[in-house]
């Protein structure tokens, strides 16, 4: 015969108001003879929760049939949980005795606490866009959880981040808690399609963490590179000049052509293409009318990207009967 052990496997049981809580208790021996009772708390002031033999416990039911001869499961269910039910519950073996039963052994106890799930994490990025190689901050917030213990992790494209700071409030006892974490992320040029993920794990989530995401496309600005080229062939009195604006993000872009310092108002042909990394390329074609009598023509392609200072690129056309090699220089 094995020595009696009272097994209460859960140290902590998180329950929700209105739901049913199951408190587990099994014994390893049928001896000594006597009943198993449930109490909340310890000492003389402990509260009797269930006694199979006597009393009326309308909210309590047993998981097993306690009248079965070899029953070793004394687990109970308590229905319609309220905040008043929190506390530590003990299953206690008594020895049958005359005139009264005597307490023999107690289980280690199960603490029943009200559990509340954290809200879905909300991730907020920076107010303004930043260029690659710079650091931006993201914040993640989740509220309304209990108990206080919670785990928060940050990921960028599936890779865990380490540069973050987390606070759980309040520090003292409370019915519910909030978490706020700030992560610092260094932007890469290819981050247009990247994501940061804030992952929150809590005992109420049964191993299924909550995630909040933010797209780095909202935080990054990739400035364009410009190239102005002259097509080698001319068509009659016209030369085709191309301005290629490469690898920029976001799409917001204004392009203007200037001829010898004068802004050209006429329509120009253009195409927008998206790169695999999420950045864009913009190509604009400008037809310049040339004649033998004209002076040299300086063409300028000016680009204003996402409200930033304009950047421009110049191309000097040397107008002769036999078109000479093109040359170009840049202006900031």
């Amino acid at each position: 015969e094995e020595e009696l052990q009272m097994i209460q496997p859960e140290k902590l049981l998180l329950v929700t108001v209105g739901k049913t809580a199951t408190l587990h208790c099994t014994v390893t021996s049928l001896l000594p003879v006597g009943p198993v009772l449930w109490f909340r708390g310890v000492g003389p002031g402990r509260e009797l929760i269930y006694n199979q033999k006597e009393g009326h416990f309308p909210r309590v039911t047993t998981v097993s049939d306690l009248t079965k001869r070899n029953n070793m499961d004394f687990s109970i269910r308590i229905s319609s949980i309220t905040p008043a039910d929190v506390g530590t519950y003990y299953c206690v073996k008594f020895r049958k005795g005359s005139p009264e039963n005597v307490e023999f052994k107690s289980g280690p106890g199960t603490e029943m606490a009200l559990g509340a799930k954290p809200s879905a994490p909300v991730v907020l990025g920076p107010a303004a866009r930043t260029t690659p190689e710079h650091t931006v901050s993201f914040t993640c917030e989740s509220h309304g959880f209990s108990p206080r213990d919670i785990t928060l992790k940050w990921f960028k494209n599936g890779n865990e981040l380490s540069d973050f700071q987390t606070n759980v409030d309040p520090t003292g006892q409370s019915v519910a808690y909030s978490i706020r974490s700030t992560a610092r992320v260094v932007l890469d040029p290819w981050d247009v399609r990247s994501q940061v993920i804030c992952e929150v794990a809590h005992v109420t989530l049964q191993g299924d963490p909550l995630r909040g995401t933010a797209n780095l496309s909202e935080a990054i600005r990739v400035p364009p590179t410009l190239e102005v080229t002259q097509q080698p062939m001319r068509v009659g009195n016209q030369v085709n000049v191309t301005c290629q604006v490469r690898k920029f993000y976001p799409q917001s872009l204004q392009l203007t052509w200037s001829e010898n310092g004068n802004v050209c108002q006429r329509e120009t042909a253009s195409t927008l293409t998206e790169n695999k990394d999420g950045t864009y390329n913009w190509t604009s074609w400008f037809l310049v009318n040339i004649s033998d009598q004209r002076d040299d023509v300086v063409l300028t392609c000016q680009v204003k990207h996402d409200g930033q200072l304009a950047v421009s690129k110049r191309l000097a056309l040397e107008v002769t009967v036999h078109q000479k090699d093109q040359s170009s220089d840049a202006t900031p």
């Epitope: 015969e1 001896l31 003879v33 049958k96 005597v102 023999f104 052994k105 107690s106």
Partner: antibody, heavy 118, light 107 residues
Framework: QVQLVQSGAEVKKPGASVKVSCKAS????????FSWVRQAPGQGLEWMGW????????GYAQKFQGRVTMTRDTSTSTVYMELSSLRSEDTAVYYC???????????WGQGTLVTVSS | EIVMTQSPATLSVSPGERATLSCRAS??????LAWYQQKPGQAPRLLIY???TRATGIPARFSGSGSGTEFTLTISSLQSEDFAVYYC?????????FGQGTRLEIK
Amino acid sequence: QVQLVQSGAEVKKPGASVKVSCKASGGTFSNYGFSWVRQAPGQGLEWMGWMSPSSGNTGYAQKFQGRVTMTRDTSTSTVYMELSSLRSEDTAVYYCARERSGSYFDYWGQGTLVTVSS
Amino acid sequence: EIVMTQSPATLSVSPGERATLSCRASQSVSSYLAWYQQKPGQAPRLLIYGTSTRATGIPARFSGSGSGTEFTLTISSLQSEDFAVYYCQQYGSLPFTFGQGTRLEIK
């Protein structure tokens, strides 16, 4: 091998108290309950009470209620039985016994003779 | 409390013969009964628990039976070392109680 070694014989005057010790070795002390059983000369066995070393819980036979106190020292794996207000009819051999499954006694001490005499 | 009554008070049996000792409980103790053997100047020794289960190291000639209120200890073929006093004990309810004992003597 489990062994229960009790303290030596005592001679006491009526009205005095006696404290008998029982040191356990060779088993997990806190896993088992210990009972005290006495046997008056030429008489049968009489259960006095029990104690759990792990919890400190005790239970005493009504006959000894108020006169007997059972304690333990887990650091030395020793249980004690103190009987107060001694009278001549308390003259007996006092045994400590290890309870198996909180029910029957699988190991016994060698016994301690307590003589109450004026 | 539950009163345990053993009979007979003394039993005289020849070595090699069978001895039957009885124990009666004043109310049902189910199968929660143990038997002990005690020799002069020694502590009791556990023989049987749960009415019929032999304790470690107890020879097969010792057997127990019964349930409820009537119990029997049988020694099938008495050996010289078996002559002693035998006690029954109930553990169905506190206080644990012993019978007054049966003295088994050589005939």
